[in-house]
Structure formats: structure tokens, C-alpha cells
């Protein structure tokens, strides 16, 4: 039961995380105008990965896309790439993890296959989350650098009568959405990897043990027993001996590491 919950929760957390990464990537508020030096501006600027916007106090908002590819800073291109890679990996991870979910039956898929798929999706979620966190962090670093550069410029060459207020940008909402979403995807991935350990049938070598159950003839094989954690539809080791009706989740609570064959 714990493994099913861990896997399910990992999937849900990753799903929310990837939705957040997509939202952050599409958002226009990656950087917003810093109002510290000019809190009474009637024009508010903010920028995203794909376009920059201006919101006038009168309520009108105008956005312009970055229609050039070569003219954009390399760092912005890198952030775009990281976010897209994160989304693609996350999307593939979601697709894989849907089939890996224990609660979903696909033909006679073995536990080992589901375990492998769970691990694959988990790794994909971890990389996806790291890509998003890296992308957002690179952008944030770029903002901090530009902020202090523009601050230095503000206080130079202002001996003249005319003041030119340079627009400075600070962290926008998308950065926080990206960090949280990346973190959630990462956590979801870790949970999937943990769930995979519970799903994976471990090879163990137990000596043959004779069991005698009243009223039943119990067959057993000496040698390599596959120790089941009780998760997944283990078709090879399925209820030849059934001492009363039980659900699979109840079977998992058995303390014994031996399967009846």
C-alpha cells in the first residue's frame, strides 16, 4: 500500500510541478520593473522569455514578441532551452509514469517492467525539475547582475539638469512559480524512484523451506525465490495457495519474504 501511495503521490506532485514549469515558461512576468527609485510611475514594464510588456496606469497593456533569434542574449536563449528541455522531459516522464502506475493494468505487464518504467519516469522528473530550477536560477542571476550594473549607471553622469531614470528590473512572479514548480517536479521524481525500489522484485537466495498448511497440498521449489514486496500483479507467484480471500494490498502486509509457488 505504501509503495502505491508513494508512486501515486509522486505522479501527482510531478504533474503539478510540470504544469507549473509550463505556466512559468509561458508567463510574461519573469522580470518586473523595480519601482524603488520611481514608485510613482504611470507606466509599468515587465518581461518574459518570449515577449516584453508595458502596462499603462490607464489599464492598457501592450506586449511585443522577441521576433529576433540572433539578437537575443545567449543567457536568455539558454534559459529558454533549459525550460523547454524541462517541459519535454517532464511530459515524456508523465507519459511513461502513467503506464507505470500500479493502479493501472496494461495487459500482463510484469512488476519488473513497471519498476523500470517508474524509475525511468522518476529520473526524467528529477532532470526536468533540475532543468527548470537551473533555468530560473540563471535568469535570476542575470537579473541581479543587470540590476547592480544599472544601479551603478544611475549614479554616474547625473551632473546635468536633465535626469534620465534608467529602468531597473527585479524578480517577477514567474521566477517563484518556476522555482516551486521545479522543486515539486524534483520531489515527485524522487518519490517515483523510491516507489520503484518497492516495486522491483529483488533476487534473493533462500534455502528451501517446507510449509504444511492444513487441508492444502503446498508445492514449493528450492533455490532462487523471488522475494515479493507484495506490490504489483506478480503473475508468476500468484495465489496458488490462498488461505482465504485477500486483496493484493492485504497480501503485502505479510511479514514472510517467501512466496508460495
Amino acid at each position: 500500500m505504501a509503495v502505491t501511495a508513494c508512486q501515486g503521490l509522486g505522479f501527482v506532485v510531478s504533474l503539478i510541478g510540470i504544469a507549473g514549469i509550463i505556466a512559468a515558461t509561458c508567463m510574461d512576468q519573469w522580470s518586473t520593473q523595480d519601482l524603488y527609485n520611481n514608485p510613482v510611475t504611470a507606466v509599468f514594464n515587465y518581461q518574459g522569455l518570449w515577449r516584453s510588456c508595458v502596462r499603462e496606469s490607464s489599464g492598457f497593456t501592450e506586449c511585443r514578441g522577441y521576433f529576433t533569434l540572433l539578437g537575443l542574449p545567449a543567457m536568455l536563449q539558454a534559459v529558454r532551452a533549459l525550460m523547454i528541455v524541462g517541459i519535454v522531459l517532464g511530459a515524456i516522464g508523465l507519459l511513461v509514469s502513467i503506464f507505470a502506475l500500479k493502479c493501472i493494468r496494461i495487459g500482463s505487464m510484469e512488476d519488473s517492467a513497471k519498476a523500470n518504467m517508474t524509475l525511468t519516469s522518476g529520473i526524467m522528473f528529477i532532470v526536468s525539475g533540475l532543468c527548470a530550477i537551473a533555468g530560473v536560477s540563471v535568469f535570476a542571476n542575470m537579473l541581479v547582475t543587470n540590476f547592480w550594473m544599472s544601479t551603478a549607471n544611475m549614479y554616474t553622469g547625473m551632473g546635468g539638469m536633465v535626469q534620465t531614470v534608467q529602468t531597473r528590473y527585479t524578480f517577477g512572479a514567474a521566477l517563484f512559480v518556476g522555482w516551486v514548480a521545479g522543486g515539486l517536479t524534483l520531489i515527485g521524481g524522487v518519490m517515483m524512484c523510491i516507489a520503484c525500489r518497492g516495486l522491483a522484485p529483488e533476487e534473493t537466495n533462500y534455502k528451501a523451506v517446507s510449509y504444511h498448511a492444513s487441508g492444502h497440498s503446498v508445492a514449493y521449489k528450492p533455490g532462487g525465490f523471488k522475494a515479493s514486496t507484495g506490490f504489483g500483479s506478480n503473475t508468476k507467484n500468484k495465489k496458488i495457495y490462498d488461505g482465504g480471500a485477500r486483496t493484493e494490498d492485504e497480501v503485502q502486509s505479510y511479514p514472510s519474504k517467501h512466496d508460495y509457488v
Epitope: 520593473q33 520611481n38 510613482v40 510611475t41 504611470a42 507606466v43 514594464n45 515587465y46 518581461q47 516584453s52 510588456c53 508595458v54 499603462e56 496606469s57 490607464s58 489599464g59 492598457f60 501592450e62 511585443r64 536633465v162 535626469q163 534620465t164 531614470v165 534608467q166 529602468t167
Partner: antibody, heavy 117, light 113 residues
Framework: QVQLQESGPGLVKPSETLSLTCTVS????????VSWIRQPPGKGLEWIGV???????NYHSTLISRVTISKDTSKNQVFLKLSSVTAADTAVYYC???????????WGQGTLVTVSS | DIVMTQSPDSLAVSLGERATINCKSS????????????LTWYQQKPGQPPKLLIY???TRESGVPDRFSGSGSGTDFTLTISSLQAEDVAVYYC?????????FGGGTKLEIK
């Protein structure tokens, strides 16, 4: 079409509060801002303040301690209150709608307010 | 506060001639985000409320004759009437629409010579 109409008492005593109403039609007060501007006789225009669609306000720094702008969106009305008036507050008071570029694209006809005892 | 200074205070121009009014701001009105100058020009005829002519320093309001044009950037702006008509006699105001308070210039009175 867009229309704005100022109304209120034409005469106010010194030290009292000037209260004016701007009734609008043809646009929504939740979407557009409305500014108050005044013009003393024979002089230039002076911006008083504005109330934006979201309800936020901005006032002229010289009047901020005396002025309040509010609105009743259900009645399509914007209100101006100017306290502790003096003869220097005698002017034609206009309300105007804010449009593109924060420019005032539609104006009321204005109402003359005289401050005198 | 941004101070708007208009020049000249009054101007007399012959009918059909070009009229030029200048406006200078104490701070730049250029917004880096969209490269637009938040300066507006108004026309006020005697006994009437002001009328919007030009916003964003050079964009004509709909219905405004094309003889009116605005130019300039940053802190220096110009309103030009290419061929003065009798109905253009009025007081012209520039306004800062970039930073609060949204200050007006002192006005330029345009008359016919």
C-alpha cells in the same frame, strides 16, 4: 458615446470642503481611470488626481493632504473632495477619462467653483 | 515632480504658415520598455474643455487633422501645425503622462498674425 458631466455647488466658503461629482456614461469605471483637473480663471491646467479602474488613486503632491477621490461604479459616478479650501482653489473643475498613453481622451464641460465667504 | 516648460508663451503666425510649439521636461519621458515617449498635447479653445490632439508624443488622436504633428524624444518635444487655419487659434498644453503627478506645461497661446 462617452460622456462626462461635473456637478456640485458653485460656491464654497473658505475652510469648508469642496465636493464635486462626475457622472459618466459610455464606458465602465471598472475598466478606465478618471482624472480631475482644475483651471483657475485665466490660468493654465493643473492636474489634481486620478482614480483608476482597479480603485487605486494618485494625487498631486501639493494637494495630497487635502484631496480624496472615490467612486461608485454602480451609479457611474466619481467624487472629488477637497478640504480646507481657500480663494486659491477657485477654478473650473474638469473630470476626464484616461485612455491610451494615459492621455485624457474625453473631458467634461467643467464646473466653476468659487471659494468666497 | 516632473516640471514641464513650454515655449513660447504666445505665438502669432499667419494663416497657412507653419506654427511650432516646444515643450521641455525636467526628466526623460521615454519608456525603455516600449520605446514610447509619454507626452501628450492638448488644444483648448476659449470657453471649452481641452481636446486631446496627440499622445505618445507623435500619435494623432482619431479625428485630429493631419496638419497637426508631434515629434521629439526624451526631454524635448515639438508640436507642429503645418498650415495654420483660423480654427486652430487656441491655447496648447503639453502634459507628462509618464510619472505622477501628471503635470501640465504652462500653455502656449496661438494667435493669427
Amino acid at each position: 458615446q462617452v460622456q462626462l458631466q461635473e456637478s456640485g455647488p458653485g460656491l464654497v466658503k473658505p475652510s469648508e470642503t469642496l465636493s464635486l461629482t462626475c457622472t459618466v456614461s459610455g464606458f465602465s469605471l471598472t475598466s478606465y481611470g478618471v482624472s480631475w483637473i482644475r483651471q483657475p480663471p485665466g490660468k493654465g491646467l493643473e492636474w489634481i488626481g486620478v482614480i483608476w479602474g482597479d480603485g487605486s488613486t494618485n494625487y498631486h503632491s501639493t494637494l495630497i493632504s487635502r484631496v480624496t477621490i472615490s467612486k461608485d461604479t454602480s451609479k457611474n459616478q466619481v467624487f472629488l473632495k477637497l478640504s480646507s479650501v481657500t480663494a486659491a482653489d477657485t477654478a473650473v473643475y474638469y473630470c476626464a477619462k484616461a485612455g491610451r498613453g494615459n492621455a485624457l481622451d474625453y473631458w467634461g464641460q467643467g464646473t466653476l467653483v468659487t471659494v468666497s465667504s | 515632480d516632473i516640471v514641464m516648460t513650454q515655449s513660447p508663451d504666445s505665438l502669432a503666425v499667419s494663416l497657412g504658415e507653419r506654427a511650432t510649439i516646444n515643450c521641455k521636461s525636467s526628466q526623460s519621458l521615454l519608456n525603455s520598455g516600449n520605446q514610447k515617449n509619454y507626452l501628450t498635447w492638448y488644444q483648448q479653445k476659449p470657453g471649452q474643455p481641452p481636446k486631446l490632439l496627440i499622445y505618445w508624443a507623435s500619435t494623432r488622436e482619431s479625428g485630429v487633422p493631419d496638419r497637426f504633428s508631434g515629434s521629439g524624444s526624451g526631454t524635448d518635444f515639438t508640436l507642429t501645425i503645418s498650415s495654420l487655419q483660423a480654427e486652430d487659434v487656441a491655447v496648447y498644453y503639453c502634459q507628462n503622462d509618464y510619472s505622477f503627478p501628471l503635470t501640465f506645461g504652462g500653455g502656449t497661446k496661438l494667435e493669427i498674425k
